[in-house]
Amino acid sequence: VTGSRVYPANEVTLLDSRSVQGELGWIASPLEGGWEEVSIMDEKNTPIRTYQVCNVMEASQNNWLRTDWITREGAQRVYIEIKFTLRDCNSLPGVMGTCKETFNLYYYESDNDKERFIRESQFGKIDTIAADESFTQVDIGDRIMKLNTEIRDVGPLSKKGFYLAFQDVGACIALVSVRVFYKKCPLTVRNLAQFPDTITGADTSSLVEVRGSCVNNSEEKDVPKMYCGADGEWLVPIGNCLCNAGHEEQNGECQACKIGYYKALSTDASCAKCPPHSYSVWEGATSCTCDRGFFRADNDAASMPCTRPPSAPLNLISNVNETSVNLEWSSPQNTGGRQDISYNVVCKKCGAGDPSKCRPCGSGVHYTPQQNGLKTTRVSITDLLAHTNYTFEIWAVNGVSKYNPSPDQSVSVTVTTNQAAPSSIALVQAKEVTRYSVALAWLEPDRPNGVILEYEVKYYEKDQNERSYRIVRTAARNTDIKGLNPLTSYVFHVRARTAAGYGDFSEPLEVTTNTVPSRIIGDGANST
């Protein structure tokens, strides 16, 4: 398991002893008395696995330490960075003849990743490593590690991998970190073209020609090319690309559209602000996402505002006539910002004992003019069962309702068929007319057929022709209709409701508001 350590972008690490959790487990020869794996603490008090040897007493030391197999990942030249601490022989009295202050670095190429033994003859020497700064007293105690860092390179390599080896010849040394890496020209973007990670060439003077590909949402103008140098730097850019959808050119780059902006097509245009009720959630949007509760229909253009389903229809009125029901309603207060509003009728048949247990009415029920896609605000439902509870739902729908169906878009009424509703009211009177109000009074129906629970007054401006009406309900046989417009003709209908349902509306009473209050007695006919 390795932890992440940050290195320059143009270096790819093949081995990092500091990133290994637990023992390194490299092979030492001899197995005992030579290199030894020891855990020390770094400046942050975290353990570091090191290899140490300090056989300074005897001459002719030949202690070898070999790494595990290191894959070369296609690299032809690799670099070895060694961080080590070397103890000054002067700090070890009486060992001047046998103590050394250098060690040797070797490598061996191999396709075999499981070689168990060190065969010294197979290894080629890279270099003798000496300390730039050896020391007499140790600096680990105050948590400041004074380390020597030496970097060597080797190549060209051709086999799948290689082993490194360290030969101690009698030094007092600790290998604190061994890192093996190769150099690459890192993925980069120049002139709107992206150039991939490219491993450097085999020798220190080679240039590798690389063809670039246009950045996302851009297209070629001239073929983009660059050269990867041996030090991992890109050289001599040629060619370029043009910005595409979701991006605009800024400072010579294709920059993603900012949040709240989008660009739908490949053009030279800048990014545009998202249409109403939409937003972009990330940079580089080619379209904008609708706000919560807002949607686009399939055939809506990306530049169109997002819309939402309509609110519920208003003022649902039912009229039961034996096994038929007439329903009327008003348009929703909110159409969701769309013109394509229509209505669907849902019929449910409910049990008398438990009204909550309802099921669909089935195909035997008929609707005039139709059940779904109604453009008018009324429907007649026939062929219902007698003595049965029905719940009718009127759903307002538009082009985006399917994306968010909700009970908030419907209004319902429950009726019982084949029960006697009250008869219609024969006489409605306007008791007082002012500029802004009309006081109405009426008589109880000739046939109440039960206890009258309430009266319902429907009224509308005469020239609206019942397209937009209002409803007032009252338990009394009179009411004041307020908030009217002066010098305007209104039509009033009244009906009674019992437990059996609503009766028919009365004949219309037409009243014109005026400028001077006067008492007018209506007889059910037109009054002015």
Epitope: I40, C54, I140, G141
Partner: antibody, heavy 121, light 106 residues
Framework: QVQLLQSGAEVKKPGASVKVPCKAS????????MSWVRQAPGQGLEWMGW????????TYAQGSTGRFVFSLDTSVSTAYLQISSLKAEDTAVYYC??????????????WGQGTLVTVSS | EIVLTQSPATLSVSPGERATLSCRAS??????PAWYQQKPGQAPRLLIY???TRATGIPDRFSASGSGTDFTLTISRVEPEDFAVYYC????????FGQGTKVEIK
């Protein structure tokens, strides 16, 4: 396994000499230095010095008198501590201990069981 | 010559408690001391040496830290077998021991 074997207790008269052997086994004798430490009764540890077992070169503690001599017989993997002109204050347990050199500092990682030298008239 | 002073002379702790032993050098040193444990009638045993490295077989409840002149040996949870005398030892051209700290049962 690695061990250091010391001789049994010695009782000496003042002015006499004593030679304390320390026989090593389980490792290459000449690869590690040997240190000598003494501990007077009820007292702490006192480092006396060490000897390079490869070259025979000794290093004595500061202030050490010439009465202490470290020597070797590598053919039998044995280090010796010789004390001459013994005094009553030389009464102590004498330990040999193998030295562990490392780049980050030194320690004595294997100890003999100690030899009690008693100087009494 | 560097003089090492250990404190306290005696430390009374109960098993399971944390024990902190101090070792102060008479002048600043750039290397951590070695630490030894000695039980009555036995030879000392190396606990910790260069760069706070535990010797072979020493449990990880023993740890050492410090810099300059002040160094510490910590026993995170004292076990019954840890009651003993502990010595710090400075290495260099001449080696010296501290006078020892006795860790006893409270």
């Amino acid at each position: 396994q690695v061990q250091l074997l010391q001789s049994g207790a010695e009782v000496k008269k003042p002015g006499a000499s004593v030679k304390v052997p320390c026989k090593a086994s389980g490792y290459t004798f000449t690869s590690r230095a040997m240190s000598w430490v003494r501990q007077a009764p009820g007292q702490g540890l006192e480092w006396m010095g060490w000897i390079n077992t490869n070259t025979g070169n000794p290093t004595y503690a500061q202030g050490s008198t010439g009465r202490f001599v470290f020597s070797l017989d590598t053919s039998v993997s044995t280090a010796y501590l010789q004390i001459s002109s013994l005094k009553a204050e030389d009464t102590a347990v004498y330990y040999c201990a193998r030295v562990r050199f490392t780049v980050y500092g030194d320690g004595m990682d294997v100890w003999g069981q100690g030899t009690l030298v008693t100087v009494s008239s | 010559e560097i003089v090492l002073t250990q404190s306290p002379a005696t430390l009374s702790v109960s098993p399971g408690e944390r024990a902190t032993l101090s070792c102060r050098a008479s002048q600043s040193v750039s290397s951590n001391p070695a630490w030894y444990q000695q039980k009555p009638g036995q030879a000392p045993r190396l606990l910790i040496y260069g760069a706070s490295t535990r010797a072979t077989g020493i449990p990880d409840r023993f740890s050492a830290s410090g810099s300059g002149t002040d160094f510490t040996l910590t026993i995170s949870r004292v076990e019954p077998e840890d009651f003993a005398v502990y010595y710090c030892q400075q290495y260099g051209p001449s080696w010296t021991f501290g006078q020892g700290t006795k860790v006893e049962i409270k």
